[in-house]
């Protein structure tokens, strides 16, 4: 007799996850006009595409790329030159240095002479022509043409002291979320940049062990909560005659300059109009300032009547960041997302004052991002459709009509497969690409910007689909639970042969940081997918109070009291999951990374007895140890007359005694520039002082991501062993 060919599918293995066997691809066109884009092919050729003529050709060959070991490129707007980027060397989250080579497309060779110094911290083309701005050793340089000698714009740059055109650590991580702090005007005449003065900022110093006889010390100016902050100044330089008149400083609004403040973003409105956004150190007041170039004074003027104030009375201004304006064609009015009177973030149209703003969207959902404003349309994303906060659909509002008509572009395209979209628009939205991240396999498509008709599938992950055919994937559910007057959305990942009449171990994965979201309708094959598929563990992710896109009442609940409701809501959810009947109460664990490590630690130390064990990777242990911009946004200042008491009460160390009855695994990279190893060192010290047994693992010379191949393999293997031991699962 032949054995029956029943279920031949196999479970995921940890090796699959660590090798990235089931990673997906996305396709973002690199738009170079209304109907043309570039894309790097599988074999590393840079290919030019014209949607309308359907022509495509190699603009830059892989052999040219390879000749300088280039991993990235950038075409000049006049299409005469391409910069090639190589020797990528990561610094912090966004920043890196690299070597840049300029290839002359017309002559078919590299530009030689007056070559760019190395390593360069940032480089970009002007929006018109082929001027180059770059930052080297914290100073900004300008080249009128790639083959010309450079002109030095700033001279103040000094390592760890003064940064020109690039942010310091805290601005990069917590305010700008970019590696650059310079912006060309649309016609390439002016260059705006920020100078960050870190001279008075305390230094975080940690050892980098390397291979040498002595470790190196890494020094970073890093303002922790309550510490001295960077001093910021914004300048604009005329790049046509940079030597005639030096950089001109842009004035700070009076109401901002009266106390400590931040610069938050810069948006060019037109060739001689710029919009700057500022924020008070106590981050509930934001000012948007529109400034104009005065030829007669050779200065930038920011009239008081062009200042727009945004204030929050229930928490902090904005979401994670204060939103940026999307200006309309008139270069005066703009669209912006901020909280409406009901506390939901929505699109508003501002013509003269914020008080007279016209609300464009409304409802008990949130507008997330404005992609593009054209003459007749506004494209944005929201989580309105069917009331699921963890979805993202793209909408078009016809702004020519009165009242404006709204159309969901994506809601019904591939309804089961695609519920979480982003988009990439050509210059005036004549065409756009949609990138769907799930819940099914990601797919990228090209669309006509007038009719929204799908023109072409750019990437549909066929190979991934085929390789997943013989894999037993877990079932994923997104649902909500109610407790009192609160609604909590959760994602549950159920083992392949899930049977409600059986009992399963439960692992809670938590992040829970303010304005974050974990319950999203996206596709993923990762460690927790493996735990469900192979080890039969039920995984749950819960968005508690403080998380985003469900209104300010829910978001601002955690204001000035981090570490309370985030934890409480995880515990509430666990109790609800137990009530569902398929969870083994004796085998419940929680794990998290970064903010999630903080929450998992506090949950383990809640004294509820709900958790048998848990893991904290790179946790924050006290908000006094974390960055000023982040900590103070949500907690205020650690001073007696402000919020010192809760800073002290909300530490993990304060709960050391409560770890006695749980198995705790504490993990941290020693070279974590973000959440310093200090955080875990203090937890460990408190646990030792309390004579509480725990497990720990450090990763030498690893940063916040513990991302080097070997470290990552070791980390996930180690955590898997710990969990399996906790859940009494055989190896």
């Amino acid at each position: 007799l032949r054995p029956s060919r029943g279920n031949t599918k196999r479970a995921l293995t940890l090796k699959d996850i660590l090798n990235g066997t089931f990673s997906y691809k996305t396709y973002f066109p690199n738009w170079i006009s209304e109907q043309e884009y570039l894309h790097q092919s599988e074999d590393d050729n840079i290919v030019f595409y014209n949607i309308e003529t359907r022509e495509s050709y190699i603009i830059l060959s892989n052999s040219t790329m390879k000749s300088v070991n280039a991993t990235d490129y950038g075409l000049s707007p006049d299409r005469q030159f391409v910069y090639l980027e190589s020797d990528y060397s990561k610094l912090w989250r966004y920043s890196y240095t690299a070597t840049y080579y300029i290839y002359d497309l017309q002559n078919g060779e590299f530009v030689r002479g007056y070559e760019l110094p190395r390593p360069i911290q940032y480089l970009c083309w002007s929006p018109v022509g082929s001027k180059l701005a770059y930052v080297y050793q914290n100073n900004i340089y300008l080249k009128q043409r790639p083959g010309d000698p450079p002109f030095q714009i700033t001279y103040t740059g000094r390592e760890n002291r003064i940064f020109n055109g690039i942010p310091d650590w805290v601005y990069e991580e917590e305010m700008l979320a970019t590696k650059y702090a310079l912006w060309w005007s649309p016609d390439g005449k002016f260059l705006a940049y920020v100078e960050f003065n870190d001279s008075d900022i305390p230094i975080i110093a940690y050892s980098y062990y390397g291979d040498g006889q002595y470790p190196r010390t890494i020094n970073i100016p890093y303002p922790k909560a309550g510490a001295k902050n960077p001093v910021v100044r914004v300048f604009i330089v005329d790049t046509t005659y940079p030597h005639h008149v030096g950089p001109m400083e842009v004035p700070v609004p009076e109401m901002i300059a009266s106390s400590d403040y931040y610069f938050s973003w810069l948006t060019w409105v037109s060739s001689e109009r710029v919009c700057l956004q500022w924020l008070k150190r106590v981050q509930n007041v934001s000012v948007l300032s529109i400034c104009d170039f005065r030829e007669d004074w050779h200065a930038w003027e920011c009239p008081k009547n062009q200042e727009h104030v945004e204030e929050s009375r229930t928490g902090w201004a904005g979401g994670f960041f204060v939103s940026t304006p999307a200006f309309s064609q008139d270069a005066t009015s703009y669209y912006k997302i901020f909280s409406d009177k009901d506390g939901y973030k929505h699109i508003h149209y501002i013509k003269d004052t914020v008080e007279n703003a016209i609300q464009i969207t409304s409802g008990k959902w949130e507008a997330i991002y404005i992609f593009r404003v054209t003459q007749d349309s506004l494209f944005y994303s929201s989580n309105e459709f069917e009331g699921y906060p963890g979805r993202r659909n793209i909408y078009r509002i016809s702004i020519g009509n009165s009242p404006p008509s709204k159309k969901c572009v994506t809601c019904h395209l591939r309804k089961e497969r695609c519920q979480y979209y982003t988009a990439s628009f050509s210059y005036k939205a004549k065409y756009y690409a949609l990138v769907c991240y799930g819940p099914g396999l990601p797919i990228s498509t090209l669309h006509d910007g007038r009719t929204d008709q799908e023109i072409q599938v750019l990437e549909e992950n066929k190979e991934l689909e085929n390789s997943l055919r013989n894999i037993q994937l877990p079932k994923v559910e997104i649902k909500k639970l109610k407790d009192g007057g609160l609604t909590f959305w959760y994602k549950m990942i159920l083992p392949p042969q899930f049977d409600r009449s059986k009992k399963y171990p439960l692992l809670i994965q938590v992040y829970g940081g303010p304005c974050s979201q974990s319950v999203k309708s996206v596709f993923a094959v990762n460690w927790i997918t493996y735990l469900a598929s192979k080890e039969g563990i039920v995984i749950a992710l819960v968005d508690g109070r403080g998380t985003a896109f469900q209104g300010d009442k829910f978001l601002h609940a955690v204001y000035r009291k981090l570490g309370v409701y985030e934890v409480e809501d995880q515990l509430t959810a666990v109790r609800k999951f137990i009530e569902m009947g398929f969870i083994d109460e004796e085998r419940i664990a929680i794990w998290g990374w970064s903010y999630g490590g903080y929450v998992s630690s506090l949950a383990l130390a809640s004294g509820t007895g709900l958790f048998k064990c848990g893991i904290a990777v790179a946790p924050v242990s006290s908000w006094e140890y974390y960055a000023s911009i982040y900590s103070e946004r949500f907690m205020g200042l650690p001073t007696k007359d402000d919020n010192l008491e809760h800073y002290k009460n909300s530490t993990v160390m304060a709960r050391a005694e409560y770890f006695r009855n749980v198995d705790y695994l504490l993990i941290h990279g020693t070279a974590d520039d973000n959440v310093h190893f200090q955080n875990s060192a203090q937890i460990a010290k408190a646990l030792v002082n309390a004579q509480v047994d725990f497990q720990a693992m450090w990763y030498s010379d690893q940063n916040h991501g513990i991302s080097s191949g070997r470290s990552q393999n070791h980390l996930y293997t180690h955590m898997t062993h710990f969990l399996k031991q906790c859940f009494s699962l055989s190896d």
Partner: antibody
Amino acid sequence: DVQLVESGGGVVRPGESLRLSCAASGFTFSSYAMSWVRQTPGEGLEWVSFISSGGAYTHYTDSVKGRFTISRDNSKNTLYLQMNSLRAEDTAVYYCAKEKEIWNAFFDYWGLGTLVTVSS
Amino acid sequence: EIVLTQSPATLNLSPGDRATLTCRASQTVGSKLAWYQQTSGQAPRLLIYDASSRATGIPDRFSGSGSGTEFTLTISSLEPEDFAVYVCQQYYDWPPLTFGGGTKVEIK
């Protein structure tokens, strides 16, 4: 084997012209940038001029700008230096030199040189 | 322009001795520095590039070190054929490409 052979040197009066040539063999000439470097008797080396692999980019030392022109014919594997308005201080042995690798303007092969004497 | 200063101008040594030659740049040249050897009446010969990489066929008694503005060429044990002029060259910031004045290594 890589070979660079200069020719065209000689004795000229101030104000006159000369054209130096450098015949290259043993490597893909069109893939490499080339330079002319000179050495006055008993003195050090002085870089004179540079030309990129395709010929689009040329550079000169200040003292020869406007008088000397570097060029190349990749189909003939030959480098040239047109020297006009010669001066006494241009007297030197002129070497052609091959750049070792793109982006690094140092020289792994040199010719034996050709002597240019400018004298009245 | 970047000026390269070599010292000493002359070095009197015997075969088997260790030779240490210095090249100083007026401003940083990173590691973009090459060393050449020139025997009388001959074309220069590339010894070291990128401050410390030995060119093809160069014996390992020749070594280069340094970065920024201070560079050293070391000949661990002088052979008779090593008595020559040694010249450094920067290719970090150009044009112009610049050479040092040279160090002459003579037999004592």
